[in-house]
């Protein structure tokens, strides 16, 4: 009669994380009496899935009666697969005795789990940066099986092709990570951009996954300063603007100063927003120019986002101003921006 | 008790070649051999390793480059298509009785050079 | 893969002195303890020194002594002899079902 063997007839088997597995054994022969174990590997190391003799395997059914005394069907379902599965999987009758020795292992079947990536993590810069300048922003995936998997990125649509990714473990795992970083470089108008981490994988079935990024949360847009003066008002006051243009974030304090003297600060409460996200202000002095017998130096101080002020300077000369009422002899503007 | 290995010879790249190791002196309820590899100069590479019952496991890099099969009196190694980083001396090792996958006994080793 | 990190790849020191080789393994070892140490000179087959991580093989001096668990291993050779010198090798068993080597460290003495 010919020697038994144990045959597994599918070398591999892929099945989904959350789903079951089933793995194929027949024997050729009831001889040997003796029963068949299942393990997850042929070394020392191996971990018994199940045997037919003893224990308890809450996860492990067979998939035909192997108790009946003519079955020579051996296969079982393993369910709830987990990347932690993977693994190649061994059929092996042992032959009756005290104890039972090893008589013959099938081929092995390789289970390889598919493992959804979870949801891509985008993160950027700590600080924000200013527009000109190229800012890092990492996208983490984890969690996924096989190893093979796409990433792109895009800024409002448009492709980056400034990034780097890397696939870890290298070798074989039960389940691997990504993470990747690219480089964006920033402009004024990029207060509504976002910028988006598209991952594919072969469990997602051609729905990529993505994670974004709004590009408001790391771009500071300074604010230009323009300080203009209004015509001379009644009982000789005039009246002097600081316009506040295109910002962001909105956080700015604004000073002005007399002759170098803090005179008022206030902070930007009502804005308008402008069509790229930036906002405008503008704050107003009042001057009353027979109160100063020389000329005044006025100047509007802005600190935006906790950044150093930048200023920009109206020269009020008072010798121009006549002091009788209704004058309206324009004061020289001789602006400057200071830092 | 002992393992030892033949079979090494020089061989042309793409030439298939087969070691054997031959196991003598025990009588063992269980017990697997092990495949390893050293080039010259270099340290220990482990290939893969098979049970008594015939179940055979493979490093990652090794799996689809060798074969460890078992015969009634050997554990023979397939060498699918040897190329020249595949020179190196060839060890068979045994392990036995303990549960902790230490490679008991070793044979002295065949060397392999694969060169045009 | 599983890595196993061995340093330093070089150590010397004076007869009857102690030699400290580390071995540290990128994940743990099946059961914390599946690490073994091999000693190979030039030309030999490797042999069995420490399995388990620190249970001496037959026939081999206590002076070897293995400690360590999970990912952290060490190998000690005190009261060092000329006969000593060689190279050391640990060896990892894991779950996955693969049994790989550290890089060796070889020891001089002197």
């Known amino acids: 009669e010919e020697e038994l063997q144990v045959i597994q007839p599918d070398k591999s088997v892929s099945v989904a994380a959350g789903e079951s597995a089933i793995l194929h054994c027949t024997v050729t022969s009831l001889i040997p009496v003796g029963p068949i174990q299942w393990f997850r590997g042929a070394g020392p190391a191996r971990e018994l899935i199940y045997n037919q003799k003893e224990g308890h395997f809450p996860r492990v059914t067979t998939v035909s009666e192997s108790t009946k005394r003519e079955n020579m069907d051996f296969s079982i379902s393993i369910s709830n697969i987990t990347p932690a599965d993977a693994g190649t999987y061994y059929c092996v009758k042992f032959r009756k005795g005290s104890p039972d020795t090893e008589f013959k292992s099938g081929a092995g079947t390789e289970l390889s789990v598919r493992a959804k990536p979870s949801a891509p993590v985008v993160s950027g810069p700590a600080a924000r940066a200013t527009p000109q300048h190229t800012v890092s922003f990492t996208c983490e995936s984890h969690g996924f099986s096989p190893r093979d998997i796409t990433l792109k990125w895009f800024k409002n649509g448009n492709e980056l092709s400034d990034f780097q990714t890397n696939v870890d473990p290298v070798g074989e795992s039960v389940s691997y990570s990504i993470h990747s970083t690219a480089k964006v470089v920033l402009t004024r108008e990029d207060v509504h951009s976002q910028v988006i981490c598209e991952v594919a994988h072969v469990t997602l079935q051609g729905d990529p996954l993505r994670g974004t990024a709004n590009l408001s949360e790391t771009i500071r847009v300074p604010p230009t300063l323009e300080v203009t003066q209004q015509p001379v008002r009644a009982e000789n006051q005039v009246n002097v603007t600081c316009q506040v243009r295109k910002f962001y974030p909105q956080r700015l304090q604004l000073t002005w100063l007399e002759n170098g003297n803090v005179s008022r600060t206030e902070t930007a409460s009502t804005v308008t927003e402008n069509k790229d996200g930036t906002y405008n202000w503008m704050s107003w002095l009042l001057v009353n120019v027979s109160a100063h017998r020389d000329d005044v130096k006025l100047t509007c101080q802005v600190e935006h986002d906790g950044q150093p002020a930048v200023s920009k300077s109206h020269d009020l000369k008072v010798s121009a101003h006549p002091k009788e009422q209704g004058s309206n002899t324009a004061a020289e503007n001789t602006g400057s921006n200071e830092r | 008790q002992s393992v030892e290995e033949s079979g090494g010879r020089l061989v042309t790249p793409g030439t298939p070649l087969t070691l054997a190791c031959t196991v003598s002196?025990?009588?063992?309820?269980?017990?697997?051999i092990s495949w390893v590899r050293q080039a010259p100069e270099k340290g220990l590479e482990y290939i893969g390793i098979i049970n008594i019952g015939g179940g055979a496991s493979y490093a990652s890099w090794a799996k689809g480059r060798f074969t460890i099969s078992k015969t009634s009196t050997t554990v023979d190694l397939k060498i699918t298509s040897p190329t020249p980083e595949d020179t190196a001396t060839y060890f068979c090792?045994?392990?036995?009785?303990?549960?902790?996958?230490?490679?008991?006994?070793w044979g002295p080793g065949t060397l392999v050079t694969v060169s045009l | 893969a599983q890595v196993l990190t061995q340093t330093p790849a070089s150590v010397s020191a004076a007869v009857g002195g102690t030699v400290t080789i580390s071995c540290q393994s990128s994940e743990s070892v099946y059961k914390n303890n599946f690490l073994s140490w091999y000693q190979q000179k030039p030309g030999k087959p490797p042999k069995l020194l420490i399995y388990?991580?620190?249970t001496l093989a037959s026939g081999v001096p206590s002076r070897f002594k293995g400690s360590g668990s999970g990912t952290q291993f060490t190998l000690t050779i005190s009261d060092l002899e000329s006969d000593d010198a060689a190279t050391y090798f640990c060896q990892g068993g894991y779950r996955t079902d693969i049994y790989p080597f550290g890089g060796g460290t070889e020891v001089v003495v002197k």
């Open positions: 002196g025990f009588s063992l309820i269980s017990y697997y």
């Open positions: 388990g991580a620190s």
């Open positions: 090792a045994m392990s036995y009785g303990m549960d902790t996958g230490a490679f008991n006994i």
